[in-house]
Amino acid sequence: AAQPNNSLMLQTSKENHALASSSLCMDEKQITQNYSKVLAEVNTSWPVKMATNAVLCCPPIALRNLIIITWEIILRGQPSCTKAYKKETNETKETNCTDERITWVSRPDQNSDLQIRTVAITHDGYYRCIMVTPDGNFHRGYHLQVLVTPEVTLFQNRNRTAVCKAVAGKPAAHISWIPEGDCATKQEYWSNGTVTVKSTCHWEVHNVSTVTCHVSHLTGNKSLYIELLPVPGAKKSAKL
């Protein structure tokens, strides 16, 4: 079965309630021309920031062609939730759906999109739109990865030794130093899926007076610098 290219566009806007909102839909320029009548699974990995709003889209098929629209939601440690709309009877049905933040954007007969209001870590999972037509099913799947921005701190704890921490990020942040030193990195995993990364570096060379900790993360990058003092210096802290 022909499948669309998974090149995507991520649109970000501001909602009235000041939450960033992102909508992931197919980039129209990337759709394969010869679309088969029955589509194999089309899946997309989608990173989305925690506390934003997310909108997930179905394939572009007009309601007049459809029999049933179903959203299947599989979240870690929970039974599969399904939200279905049957066109013939104009009725919606939900099975095992407990999260009130996951809803249809509007009436399914007007808009088949699914929205997640104020994305939380618990929304990590797989979301699939299934459009049932008389001649087969069209699928659009999303592996939703919730991103959590780590809190970054940098401080000196011993003579010519600095500690850079990226606390409670998801996924784990990557820490690098300028200039490079003699470093040890540890990761601490939390039950909610976040990770704290701690990098401790020592510089023996005495002409190194200022060091920079660079934290790379999917939500953005952050650099902090500190002067190496003979005694521990002031603590620096920042959000990405």
């Epitope: 129209e28 759709i31 572009p60 098929i61 007049r64 062609n65 999109d113 008389p134």
Partner: antibody, heavy 119, light 110 residues
Framework: EVQLVESGGGVVQPGGSLRLSCAAS????????MHWVRQAPGKGLEWIGY????????NYNEKFKGRATLSSDKSKNTAYLQMNSLRAEDTAVYYC????????????WGQGTLVTVSS | DIQMTQSPSSLSASVGDRVTITCRAS??????????MHWYQQKPGKAPKLLIY???NLESGVPSRFSGSGSGTDFTLTISSLQPEDFATYYC????????FGQGTKVEIK
């Protein structure tokens, strides 16, 4: 190969009616929405309405409501357009076109049939 | 109903010219990241032929000199280098709700 063939065109008297046929082949007839469009001589395309043979769901351009009726015969794989109270301005080539699912685009059209309303 | 305004209604061009036709909808024809706007070519005595669907996707078998762009209410069909067989009438069409065609643009030989 998908094919749509219209028939039933010809000369009709003002006030009369027409019944056009669109015979479909090369696909499962009940699976796709069929649209009807007309084009007056030297004019643009005008959407009349559609029928979904799967469930006989129909929808019409407001202009043709009450005067046009769409139907289908699943056993014959044929869609029909019936139009009543014909006027000279209904003189046109009438087309049927199949809507594809993805993008709701019209990938297949019939060749058209000419209806002339004249006394 | 959504009204479609196509411009120009006609244009004269030469082989090799770049031709641009625009279509404006009275309200947005985009939803869920897709624009339900299509472009068709029609030659005298023939049925229309699909060129572009969902605003910017080239239908299979259509030459790459044809391209479409736009979203929301404003759309464009571009022929990068006009060929002799491209002299025809072009229509935009939306299929989001009830369907409407633009009034057509006739591309004639200069």
């Amino acid at each position: 190969e998908v094919q749509l063939v219209e028939s039933g065109g010809g000369v009709v008297q003002p006030g009369g009616s027409l019944r056009l046929s669109c015979a479909a082949s090369g696909y499962t007839f009940t699976s796709y929405v069929m649209h009807w469009v007309r084009q007056a001589p030297g004019k643009g395309l005008e959407w009349i309405g559609y029928i979904n043979p799967y469930n006989d769901d129909t929808n019409y351009n407001e202009k043709f409501k009450g005067r046009a009726t769409l139907s289908s015969d699943k056993s014959k794989n044929t869609a029909y357009l019936q139009m009543n109270s014909l006027r000279a301005e209904d003189t046109a080539v009438y087309y049927c076109a199949r809507e594809d699912y993805y993008g709701s685009r019209w990938g297949y059209w019939g060749q058209g049939t000419l209806v002339t309303v004249s006394s | 109903d959504i009204q479609m305004t196509q411009s120009p209604s006609s244009l004269s061009a030469s082989v090799g010219d770049r031709v641009t036709i625009t279509c404006r909808a009275s309200k947005s024809v985009s939803t869920s990241g897709y624009s339900y706007m299509h472009w068709y070519q029609q030659k005298p005595g023939k049925a229309p032929k699909l060129l572009i669907y969902l605003a910017s996707n080239l239908e299979s078998g259509v030459p790459s000199r044809f391209s479409g762009s736009g979203s929301g209410t404003d759309f464009t069909l571009t022929i990068s280098s006009l060929q002799p067989e491209d002299f025809a009438t072009y229509y935009c069409q939306h299929s989001r709700e009830l369907l409407t065609f633009g009034q057509g643009t006739k591309v004639e030989i200069k």
